[in-house]
Interface confidence: low
């Protein structure tokens, strides 16, 4: 039993690595968008026991325009940097290389995404010919944490934040 292609999520892509039952996959917000706090990018292939049909759980993901980009003005044609400071990117981004032999489920095919391998120890290796990053999955026998009977986290939100799975109320982000 396998799942059909997952649903589209606005401003997000998903690279499905396995359509098999209980597979977990993660959506990635497109370039220029970010995951709204408290929303989940995870989806799981589950079985509807009544119909014996597999389907993907509905992610609560909301991809909002990155506020850091929304308010940026285009740079003038020529600028002079007087302090000798080289502007640096705010944070490091995924490589944007598309993994081979994967099909995107997306409403924006122009977006670049990074493949996320759930529950895998990352052993990236550079491909000598293309320079793309290959991500290998190593199982528990290679010294990675046990993947069996993972205990649910009993997390308690700090300060005024709600527990996991409860979306923050009155969040100012808008799409």
């Amino acid at each position: 039993i396998t799942c059909p292609p997952p649903m589209s999520v606005e401003h997000a892509d998903i690279w499905v690595k396995s359509y098999s039952l209980y597979s977990r996959e993660r959506y990635i917000c497109n370039s220029g968008f970010k995951r709204k706090a408290g929303t989940s990018s995870l989806t799981e292939c589950v079985l509807n026991k009544a119909t014996n049909v597999a389907h993907w759980t509905t992610p609560s993901l909301k991809c909002i325009r990155d506020p850091a980009l929304v308010h940026q003005r285009p740079a003038p044609p020529s600028t002079v940097t007087t302090a000798g400071v080289t502007p640096q990117p705010e944070s490091l981004s995924p490589s944007g290389k598309e993994p081979a032999a994967s099909s995107p489920s997306s409403n924006n095919t122009a977006a670049t995404t990074a493949a996320i391998v759930p529950g895998s120890q990352l052993m990236p290796s550079k491909s000598p010919s293309t320079g793309t990053t290959e991500i290998s999955s190593h199982e528990s026998s290679h010294g990675t944490p046990s993947q069996t009977t993972a205990k649910n986290w009993e997390l308690t939100a700090s300060a005024s934040h709600q527990p996991p799975g409860v979306y923050p109320q009155g969040h100012s982000d808008t799409t």
Epitope: A37, G38, S91, S93, V117, S120, W153, A157, H161, G165
Partner: nanobody, 124 residues
């Protein structure tokens, strides 16, 4: 190239403190939640703490609440776990991981990426 590299583990007496560090690179901090989980020999892995970088929300397991503090330095792409009043039962390998605070209860705690781990041993 995504990398998570933990450091700061070691041997400490009960009641002591340690500060674990996680150097992260290769992804946009704000797009993910980052946290710590641990695994003691012969035991299930256990979530310790989680921070949603997009809004700064922090979450703690009941077993460490009030003793552990998670923090981050986004400019340096670093995540820290300050562990105070350590107990013998805190002995484990501690892993820094990219995860999703919002789904750890609904989907059992899924760790997308994790580092090689750092050993923390608390002696009596």
């Amino acid at each position: 190239e995504v990398q998570l590299v933990e450091s700061g583990g070691g041997l400490v007496q009960a009641g002591g403190s340690l500060r674990l560090s996680c150097a992260a690179s290769g992804f946009t901090f704000d797009d993910y939640a980052i946290g710590w989980f641990r695994q003691a020999p012969g035991k299930e892995r256990e979530g310790v703490s989680c921070m949603d970088s997009s809004d700064g929300s922090t979450y703690y397991a009941d077993s460490v609440k009030g003793r552990f503090t998670i923090s981050s330095d986004n400019a340096k792409n670093m995540v820290y776990l300050q562990m105070n009043s350590l107990k013998v039962e805190d002995t484990a390998v501690y892993y820094c991981a990219i995860l999703d605070c919002a789904v750890v209860t609904t989907l059992g705690g899924e760790y997308d990426y994790w580092g090689q781990g750092t050993q923390v041993t608390v002696s009596s």
